[in-house]
Every structure is written in structure tokens, then in C-alpha cells.
């Protein structure tokens, strides 16, 4: 074989270069034919009525032609012919890659509730070959299920992702990313999750600052409730008892002036929204007034589990006997 060609892969709309090379030339006519076996070039002359073909180089050892604005219909075998005895022929295959026309992401619900499973679909239309779709929630890759539909040598890929949402997912992007040989860099589309969740309630002691409650002192507790939608109702109650008469309620704040031992007990902040309700408890223990001048040594330890936060305050030498759990979130 005296005639050589190389296969060509080109992205739709770009330029393909076809080269016919002759090892030992005897000045025979070299001709390039299209997949319909019509002559594109006869040596350096183009008889074919398609001006997208242009001569790059012609010599006795090479015919090199460019094809601009390549379309899917240009795909196929191109033949180099050498008018020798016997005539020689070699073919090159042009493969046309088509990037996905459109990338669409569709979420089953605009707003989901924590714990709910939602369906997210991503469609990459009319590519060749078929597109690979990858899913990410933030930076975490997830596994979807893809279906491929073929029509006229083009592929439409739809990938389905079933996603159980959590409150932490609120505002996190769900990313549909395509991988395709005709696409350089990242081609992706994303939608931000909107997740509604029941309130998370935290009680913060804003006074006294050192955290030790003694007779005669004041106590101020602030209830922080975060949820989506933002909780409409934040209420304070005293568990198993009436609220002290000298307690003042002001929105999320509970203020008890002139503490005494009868105020001991559990104070609960309750918050609710359309998703549900939650509460956090504060256990008040009122200590005797101080008998010594030096300030007490205070150690604060916070222990967190997935469902409950326990705040333990060890206040002085008696705390070994009287140490109490002060705040519990539910």
C-alpha cells in the first residue's frame, strides 16, 4: 500500500483536515472522494460544488484539504484514490462530535421539607456521542440514574436523581455536570435547594455573665429559634409550674428579677413554624448569696449530640453535690 490517510475527529462547526499521503509517487493523479464517492478534489482542482472544502497543500506526495463548518451530515468515509496500475484507494473516517445543545435541570418541587425525598432531573439534549451526566450536591458527588434516547444519530440523555433533603441542604446547589468529548472545561447547570425545616431552639443566658445564679440576683434568658420559614411563635413556659409573678416576658427574652429559691425549676422556650415545633429547656438552680469575697472559679463544658445539647455548669466547691444540668435542647 502506497497511499496513507488518518482518521479525523472533529467538533461540529469546526474544521476537519483530511490528508492523503503518497509514499512513492509516480505523478499519478491523486483524488479525494466524499462518502458518496463524488470527487472533492482532483489533484489541486475542486470540481465539487461545496466551497467549504479548500486546498491546504498539493504536491506529488500529498493532497491536504480542509473542511470548514463541519456538520453531522459530513460524517463518514472519505476516499483517497491514486490512479495507478492497479488503482489504489485508502479511506479516512471523519467522526463528528456534537456537544449537547441544551442542558436543563428540573426540580420536582421548588421547596421541600426536611426528610422528604425529591426528584431532580437533568437533560442534555442532542449530543453525539451520548453525554455522561454527573451529579453533585455542593462538593459531594451523588449517583443518578441515566436514560439515553437516540434519534437520527444524536443522543438525548436524561439523568434522574432521588434526593432525601436535610435542613443542612438549604441553600446548597444541586449541580448537573456533563462530560462529553466535544466539551472542554465544565459544562454544568445548577439549582439551589430550598429546604423547610422545623425550628432549632437554643437558650442563651445573657445575665448573669458568669453563669452562677444566686438569691437576689437577676436572670435574663434569650431564646434563639432558627427555622425555615422563620418561626412565627416563640413562647416561654415553666414546666410543671406557673411562671413566677415577677418574671417578665419580652419577645424571645425571659427576665426574672430578685431570684429566690422558689424560682428553681425548668423553663422551656417553645418555637413553631409550618413544619413543626421544637423546644429547649433551661434548669434554674438558685444558689445561696455569696459568703466569701473571692470570685468563684467557673468551668463550662458543652456536650453535643445529634439531638440534645447539655450544658453543665460547675460553679464552686459545692457544685459536686449540687451541680445541675442547666439547658437541654429538643
Amino acid at each position: 500500500q502506497n497511499l496513507f490517510t488518518k482518521d479525523v475527529t472533529v467538533i461540529e462547526g469546526e474544521v476537519a483536515t483530511i490528508s492523503c499521503q503518497v509514499n512513492k509517487s509516480d505523478d499519478s493523479v491523486i483524488q479525494l472522494l466524499n462518502p458518496n464517492r463524488q470527487t472533492i478534489y482532483f489533484r489541486d482542482f475542486r470540481p465539487l460544488k461545496d466551497s467549504r472544502f479548500q486546498l491546504l497543500n498539493f504536491s506529488s506526495s500529498e493532497l491536504k484539504v480542509s473542511l470548514t463548518n463541519v456538520s453531522i451530515s459530513d460524517e463518514g468515509r472519505y476516499f483517497c484514490q491514486l490512479y495507478t496500475d492497479p488503482p489504489q484507494e485508502s479511506y479516512t473516517t471523519i467522526t463528528v462530535l456534537v456537544p449537547p445543545r441544551n442542558l436543563m435541570i428540573d426540580i420536582q418541587k421548588d421547596t421541600a421539607v426536611e426528610g422528604e425525598e425529591i426528584e431532580v432531573n437533568c437533560t442534555a439534549m442532542a449530543s453525539k456521542p451520548a453525554t455522561t451526566i454527573r451529579w453533585f450536591k455542593g462538593n459531594t458527588e451523588l449517583k443518578g440514574k441515566s436514560e439515553v434516547e437516540e434519534w437520527s444519530d444524536m443522543y438525548t440523555v436524561t439523568s434522574q436523581l432521588m434526593l432525601k433533603v436535610h435542613k443542612e441542604d438549604d441553600g446548597v446547589p444541586v449541580i448537573c455536570q456533563v462530560e462529553h468529548p466535544a466539551v472542554t472545561g465544565n459544562l454544568q447547570t445548577q439549582r439551589y435547594l430550598e429546604v423547610q425545616y422545623k425550628p432549632q431552639v437554643h437558650i442563651q443566658m445573657t445575665y448573669p455573665l458568669q453563669g452562677l445564679t444566686r438569691e437576689g440576683d437577676a436572670l435574663e434568658l434569650t431564646c434563639e429559634a432558627i427555622g425555615k420559614p422563620q418561626p412565627v411563635m416563640v413562647t416561654w413556659v415553666r414546666v410543671d409550674d406557673e411562671m413566677p409573678q415577677h418574671a417578665v416576658l419580652s419577645g424571645p427574652n425571659l427576665f426574672i428579677n430578685n431570684l429566690n429559691k422558689t424560682d428553681n425549676g425548668t423553663y422551656r422556650c417553645e418555637a413553631s413554624n409550618i413544619v413543626g415545633k421544637a423546644h429547649s429547656d433551661y434548669m434554674l438552680y438558685v444558689y445561696d448569696p455569696p459568703t466569701t469575697i473571692p470570685p468563684p472559679t467557673t468551668t463550662t463544658t458543652t456536650t453535643t449530640t445529634t439531638t440534645t445539647t447539655i450544658l453543665t455548669i460547675i460553679t464552686d466547691s459545692r457544685a459536686g453535690e449540687e451541680g445541675s444540668i442547666r439547658a437541654v435542647d429538643h
Epitope: T39, P47, L48, K49, P87
Partner: antibody, heavy 111, light 108 residues
């Protein structure tokens, strides 16, 4: 001067033979495919035969296939047409022409 | 074998424009070439490819193709343009040649 000059035409009986020659000058003969085209008296042009630049490739019109043979001698810059089993309808002026897909150079013809 | 069809004769007033047409399926694929032949002379290439002219051919000669019809236009015909004009192409395989029957152009 770039030119083609045909010779070898003449009167021959039906069934007879004739060999036409075409001498090329002024260009690299071995580089070009060549053709024979004929024109019967008062008629249009009719393509007869083609040959590749090295001589290995040949094609014929259906009307002459099996009776005519095209050949070339690149060392002599000459194109030939061997015509056998001649018929009255082969009467024509025979032109040799240079092939670049189109025919850009013609001889004056031989009858 | 393909066939190319030409009108047998057309006439044109001196200095006017004449269009000679040639019909054939091959022109859907390939460009035509056109040859001028005066009495007693060999044919002469006047137009080829995508409206190209060999050197020495006046620019009043131009070629075009549309669908299966190739055309040769002489814009501002001169007395010396009176001749027979032949269209030529190859069949779709590119191996066999075919000529039109010729059009006799008379300049009045």
C-alpha cells in the same frame, strides 16, 4: 510552446484498424492524465477514452469499449489510440486533450 | 451514462447579453466547464469550476450553476463570440466524461 499535435488519421475500411498518435510538447506530459475526444462531421463533441498520468488507469466510452485501446509512452511524450474493428460511425475528427478535470489544452485534431 | 441537454441555438444582438444553459443531474454535484468552438478549429476552454476563466479569456464570459442547470453568460456579446458552445462534466463517479449537444450562438 505548450501544444498537442495529433496524427495517424486516414481512410480505412469498416472492420479495419488505425493507430492515432498525439505528440505533446512544452509541458510535463507525464504529470497529466490525457483524453481522446471525437467530433463526427456536423455533430457535437463525444468523449472517447481517458488514461492516467502513469498509464495504469484507463476508461472508455461504451461506444468504443472492447475495440479501442488508449496508451501512452511518457518517455516519448506521446499518447496513442489503437482503433480496431472500425465502423462507419467512428468517422470523426479525433482530438487529444489534457485533463485537469476540465480540458484546458486541445490538439488541432486528426480526421 | 449521464446526459447533458443544451438548446441547439440562440441568437443575441451585438453588445447584448446571452445566457446558454445546460441541464444534467451531474450539476447538482459538480461544476461545469464550457468550451467555445469556431468552425474548423479545436474547442477552447472558456469557463471552468466556480466561474474561473483561463488566461486570455475575456471577463464577459461567466459561469454559474443552480440545481441541475449550468449556465454560461456572455455579457455584451461581440461578433467574435459567434461559435458553438459545449458544456462538459463528469458523471457522479467522476470517471466518465459527458458533453452537452452544443449550442450555436449567432451574434446579430
Amino acid at each position: 510552446e505548450v501544444q498537442l499535435l495529433e496524427s495517424g488519421g486516414g481512410l480505412v475500411q469498416p472492420g479495419g484498424s488505425l493507430r492515432l498518435s498525439c505528440a505533446a510538447s512544452g509541458f510535463t506530459f507525464s504529470f497529466y492524465p490525457m483524453q481522446w475526444v471525437r467530433q463526427a462531421p456536423g455533430k457535437g463533441l463525444e468523449w472517447v477514452s481517458s488514461i492516467g498520468s502513469s498509464g495504469g488507469y484507463t476508461k472508455y466510452a461504451d461506444s468504443v469499449k472492447g475495440r479501442f485501446t488508449i496508451s501512452r509512452d511518457n518517455s516519448k511524450n506521446t499518447l496513442y489510440l489503437q482503433m480496431n474493428s472500425l465502423r462507419a460511425e467512428d468517422t470523426a475528427v479525433y482530438y487529444c486533450t489534457r485533463d485537469r478535470w476540465y480540458f484546458d489544452l486541445w490538439g488541432r485534431g486528426t480526421l | 451514462q449521464s446526459e447533458l441537454t443544451q438548446d441547439p441555438a440562440v441568437s443575441v444582438a451585438l453588445g447584448h447579453t446571452v445566457k446558454i444553459t445546460c441541464q444534467g443531474d451531474t450539476f447538482r454535484t459538480y461544476y461545469a466547464s464550457w468550451y467555445q468552438q469556431k468552425p474548423g478549429q479545436a474547442p477552447l476552454l472558456v469557463v471552468y469550476g466556480e466561474n474561473k476563466r483561463p488566461s486570455g479569456i475575456p471577463d464577459r464570459f461567466s459561469g454559474s450553476t443552480s440545481g441541475n442547470t449550468a449556465s454560461l453568460t456572455i455579457t455584451g456579446a461581440q461578433a467574435e463570440d459567434e461559435a458553438d458552445y459545449y458544456c462538459h462534466s463528469r458523471d457522479n463517479s467522476g470517471h466518465l466524461h459527458v458533453f452537452g449537444g452544443g449550442t450555436k450562438v449567432t451574434v446579430l
